[in-house]
């Protein structure tokens, strides 16, 4: 809910900095939650749904309290580069009953790749490294059916959707120790 | 119909600790984060902290910091609270609240827990 | 952390009448489009219940009486026209930054 974000202000203090990190992130998070309602009122969906080649939940891999800067930012990029595959691969491989959700889709993974550049910046600013992903890039097939295509697509959105909630409470929280 | 269900009201004495319940219905327990604010008499509302049931830790404001402990019991849709080293001032209504993720307005609250120090 | 000041601590107005509460924080809580306010009406022995989201967007349920506005460090809830029921108090809370904050309330009693 609420409106678009415009442009954060770039900038050389680290807080503002982490400020237009976080404006981006509760903006993605709305337009992800804003498509996970259309997709349950489109294609409801019957409890939880995972898929292997997503990214653990960075929530289960300690509290919050104990998160550094560094260890947070390099984590929520590499996730959300991975998020941001999935993405790609949904709107490619996604067939006919996705394509009705194309355009919401196509603005998603925009403000993804926004983000992850801002990130990028971030990141480069404070002088941290660049980091690969610490796993191999597990290969997406198609779809095994509509229902597949799906189901992943929930599962895709469910799991953004607690990431960026992960990353906007972590980035805030740590904005108050700078 | 979504509702939270706080358990009822604690009379404790200083140095005690106390654990509140909430237990969630009507919808996806892990939608949201579950939120706790603290009313003392005359006083403002003041923030706790939250948690997000799908795992991970807990945030707190740093007044509640090494006081308040926030849990979950994902199975049973229950959030909790636990206050310890009670004193006087943790006299207040708690209340556990629905908490929209990444934005912190609470649309859903339980009906308040009444926790009463004295000695 | 930010202060959020409410203004007038009480205010009598009569049913029928416009009625404009006022919350002033100690620094902006919006950013490029967005106004982290919210504002909550309480009763005696009742839970807060939320009216207003993100400064200006009516909650689910809540009567087209209510409106918010406002921008950077000042924000109005206003009434236009009160019902018996409105009578109660009013808090605003920011959540801008962590740790949210809430008004000291205002209140809002029958004249």
């Known amino acids: 809910p609420g409106p678009p974000a415009g442009s954060p202000r770039v900038s050389s203090d680290p807080r503002a900095d982490l400020d237009s990190a976080v404006l981006l992130t509760r903006s993605l998070l709305a337009d992800t939650r804003q498509l996970a309602a259309q997709m349950r009122d489109k294609f409801p969906a019957d409890g939880d749904h995972s898929l292997d080649s997503l990214p653990t939940l960075a929530m289960s891999a300690g509290t919050l309290g104990s998160l550094q800067l560094p260890g947070v930012l390099t984590r929520l990029r590499v996730d959300l580069m991975s998020y941001l595959r999935h993405v790609q691969w949904l709107r490619r491989a996604g067939g006919p009953s996705l394509k009705t959700l194309e355009p919401e889709l196509g603005a998603l993974q925009a403000r993804l790749e926004r983000l992850l550049r801002r990130l990028q910046l971030l990141m480069s600013r404070l002088a941290l490294p660049q980091a690969a992903p610490d796993q191999p890039v597990i290969p997406l097939g198609p779809p095994a059916s509509a229902w597949g295509s799906i189901r992943a697509a929930h599962a895709i959105l469910g799991g953004l959707h607690l990431t960026l909630d992960w990353a906007v409470r972590g980035l805030l929280l740590l904005k108050t120790r700078l | 119909e979504v509702q939270l269900v706080q358990s009822g009201a604690e009379v404790k004495k200083p140095g005690a600790s106390v654990k509140i319940s909430c237990k969630a219905s009507?919808?996806?327990?892990?939608?949201?984060?579950m939120d706790w604010v603290k009313q003392a008499p005359g006083q403002r509302l003041e923030w706790i902290g939250d948690?997000?049931?799908?795992?991970?830790?807990?945030i707190y404001n740093q007044k509640f910091t090494g006081r308040a402990t926030l849990t979950v019991d994902k199975s049973a849709s229950t959030a909790y609270m636990e206050l310890s080293s009670l004193r006087s001032e943790d006299t207040a209504v708690y209340y556990c609240?629905?908490?929209?993720?990444?934005?912190?307005?609470?649309?859903?609250w339980g009906q308040g827990t009444t926790v009463t120090v004295s000695s | 952390d930010i202060v959020l000041t409410q203004s007038p601590a009480s205010l009598a107005l009569s049913p029928g009448e416009r009625a404009t509460l006022s919350c002033r924080a100690s620094?902006?809580?919006?950013?490029?489009?967005?106004?982290?306010i919210h504002w909550y009406q309480q009763k005696p022995g009742q839970a807060p219940r939320l009216l207003i989201y993100?400064?200006?967007n009516l909650e689910s349920g809540v009567p087209a009486r209510f409106s918010g506005s406002g921008s950077g460090t000042d924000f109005t809830l206003t009434i236009s026209s009160l019902e018996e029921e409105d009578f109660a108090t009013y808090y605003c809370?920011?959540?801008?930054?962590?740790?949210?904050?809430f008004g000291q309330g205002t209140k809002l009693e029958i004249k």
């Open positions: 948690i997000n049931p799908h795992g991970g830790g807990p």
């Open positions: 609240a629905r908490g929209e993720l990444g934005h912190w307005y609470f649309d859903v």
């Open positions: 993100l400064a200006s």
């Open positions: 809370q920011h959540s801008r930054d962590l740790p949210p904050t």
């Open positions: 009507g919808y996806t327990f892990t939608d949201y984060n």
């Open positions: 620094k902006s809580v919006s950013t490029s489009g967005y106004s982290y």
